[in-house]
Interface confidence: low
């Protein structure tokens, strides 16, 4: 399955943190979304394979890396109030 941590996080403005996402299904495609009221799911960053990442529709303020097939951490560089959201990691073939 897909394991995403932490489940809940409170940050002060300007803090940085990493949301971890790991999958054990050997999926090539992994992506991070944010869900905000009235906006649905919006793609932040995605990866089509190890070592390959690209920006989604709302990438600003976030970075990702895909060094292995399994892991796709999302980094909040400097937390802003506008980044208050529910975050989802997904993977697929």
């Amino acid at each position: 399955g897909v394991t995403q941590t932490p489940k809940f996080q409170v940050l002060k403005t300007g803090q940085s943190m990493t949301l971890q996402c790991a999958q054990d299904m050997n999926h090539e495609y992994m992506s991070w979304y944010r869900q905000d009221p009235g906006m649905g799911l919006r793609l932040i960053h995605y990866s089509v394979g190890a070592g390959i990442t690209d920006q989604g529709e709302v990438p600003n303020g976030y970075n990702v890396s895909r060094s292995t097939t399994e892991d796709f951490p999302l980094r909040l560089l400097s937390a802003a109030p506008s980044q208050t959201s529910v975050y989802f990691c997904a993977s697929s073939y």
Epitope: S67, T68, L77
Partner: antibody, heavy 119, light 107 residues
């Protein structure tokens, strides 16, 4: 706070190899990329390559491919850069730098290791 | 390889001056530029990432801007500790490349 401590200065003969170490602390070593950059006397900065500590995956500058090997030992939180077939033009200060915010942004740097190649 | 061309190479200024350093990329690097400061005999220190984001602890007098191929680093009011060499770095594509540096000297 992220800290990178590099090994001491080296004097090498042309044709030999050098291995420089970089010990990291203050962050999760497995989740970082360690880059190696060199600076020849009076010159600018030149990127050599990087390793992802968690997997050992590497990316090299084509200019150094075949001569440079970058590795990481997660048990000691130490990265290594080995450069072979040394020539006088390799005389430089060699820096390690860690990418923490993004995998190719050099966020924090080691203090540098001077390598002198001379016969 | 992407070439990063900085100007000027040397800059003389006085404490309190506002200075701007420019970096031009040979191709589009979006906002993927970092500015580093290096003092003599010391390792570089990252100041600004993704064109305009200051690192924690970097004074607000340092600011960055630009996207595409043209980027600027501005120091709004020079302090004695700001006299150093400044490098831009692109992280859009491999190999990562740096500008040749701008040496900021006291007038």
């Amino acid at each position: 706070q992220v800290q990178l401590v590099q090994s001491g200065a080296e004097v090498k003969k042309p044709g030999s190899s050098v291995k420089v170490s970089c010990k990291a602390s203050g962050h999760d070593f497995r989740l970082t990329y360690i880059h190696w950059v060199r600076q020849a006397p009076g010159q600018g900065l030149e990127w050599m390559g990087r390793v992802y500590a968690g997997s050992g995956n590497t990316k090299y500058n084509e200019k150094f491919k075949g001569r440079v090997t970058i590795t990481a030992d997660t048990s000691t939180s130490t990265a290594y850069m080995e450069l072979s077939s040394l020539r006088s033009e390799d005389t430089a200060v060699y820096y390690c730098a860690v990418s923490y915010y993004s995998y190719d942004v050099l966020d924090y740097w080691g203090q540098g290791t001077t390598v002198t190649v001379s016969s | 390889d992407i070439q990063m061309t900085q100007s000027p190479s040397f800059l003389s200024a006085s404490v309190g001056d506002r200075v701007t350093i420019t970096c031009k990329a040979s191709q589009n690097v979006e906002d993927r530029v970092v500015w580093h400061q290096q003092k003599p005999g010391k390792a570089p220190k990252a100041l600004i990432y993704s064109s305009s984001h200051r690192y924690k602890g970097v004074p607000s007098r340092f600011s960055g801007s630009g996207s595409g191929t043209e980027f600027t680093l501005t120091i709004s009011s020079l302090q004695p500790e700001d006299f150093a060499t400044y490098f831009c770095q692109q992280f859009k594509s491999y190999p990562l490349t740096f500008g040749q540096g701008t040496k900021l000297e006291i007038k």
